[in-house]
Amino acid sequence: KEEQISFRDCAEVFKSGHTTNGIYTLTFPNSTEEIKAYCDMEAGGGGWTIIQRREDGSVDFQRTWKEYKVGFGNPSGEYWLGNEFVSQLTNQQRYVLKIHLKDWEGNEAYSLYEHFYLSSEELNYRIHLKGLTGTAGKISSISQPGNDFSTKDGDNDKCICKCSQMLTGGWWFDACGPSNLNGMYYPQRQNTNKFNGIKWYYWKGSGYSLKATTMMIRPADF
């Protein structure tokens, strides 16, 4: 019987010869549990595992802790891959995180972190980031040092307010902080002066809600 080949991430998929963009089945590290993810096999050399995408407002991102844990949405469109998978994956080896952003005026920018991982659920999937480069601001729009993840039913932020309820979406809120890529999706001409939109402050400033975002990870030694 032929042994089933399993892939931990899109970098392994790419190295196996599958170099076409699309949805692939990945396997949790040290497990048989599977998850579907979108792989970008073209951008910057390929092998990118997409862990978040916003593009049209078709998916509600005001979700529970459990939903952010296991993931939601459609990998071919708007989705969140899942904190548990990303946590397990990024604790196996060193990963880079690239965040690609689009505004409503046709501009694009990115932030690249040379080391990214999420703590375990016991530590509230706290985000850890090092080494920022890119065109989406010289200062990290994800507060440093990293914060715990918060959702509407899991308030772990540093504010005596409920950032996830106020600003909508699950995110690594501070109090409440300069970014939230899981905020409310606002269409063009309704995307300014918003406090609960899709924000990346150190690129677009106050109240600007972005058109599209993609968060992607890849092993640092790819």
């Epitope: 504010c159 005596i160 307010c161 950032c163 918003k194 406090f195 609960n196 106050s206």
Partner: antibody
Amino acid sequence: QVQLVQSGAEVKKPGASVKVSCKASGYNFKGYYMHWVRQAPGQGLEWMGWINPNSGGTNYAQKFQGRVTMTRDTSISTAYMELSRLRSDDTAVYYCARSPNPYYYDSPGYYYPAAFDIWGQGTMVTVSS
Amino acid sequence: SYVLTQPPSVSVAPGQTARITCGGNNIGSKSVHWYQQKPGQAPVLVVYDDSDRPSGIPERFSGSNSGNTATLTISRVEAGDEADYYCQVWDSSSDHWVFGGGTKLTVLS
């Protein structure tokens, strides 16, 4: 860790002015409003006003309008409260306290009335002839 | 301007439940915050937004708010809970913060 450290006790004559400082550390100074609250001996808490360290904007309690001035120096993360034309009934402990501005990165001028989560240790101001 | 009314004092035996009230016109429509102040010390936030606790505050402290009365409840009272307690609300009509007059909690020995 997060803390607010105030200047030391003051003794002033009636008619004089006093300026109390409050140095913040351990957090983003601009992302939190700074309030001033006073407490006369044996009495309750009385809110005097707030300053937005980001913009410098202020909101003073009506009782203190014209006598109080709140300022800040963001380069040293310090807020100041100056009270002029002092009277004997201004004798009190003066506290600074912060409250988060969750919309700091979104709508910097919008005031969100969050509770006061960190307080300074207090500054005793005695007004006596 | 908006007025908050608290009882001057509340006494309770150790291990019992203390309830401190804060009265105000339609206070249930406002967010109420509660502070504890021990002698010679600065106030400490113990409950915010009616019923939420900051980190580090024991679960024994809880709050509720409806109608014209907000209540701070301290269950299984300990000697260390003896302090003054103040309620606070934001009065949006005057854009001012308002404190209640304070309640002295005495833990009977």
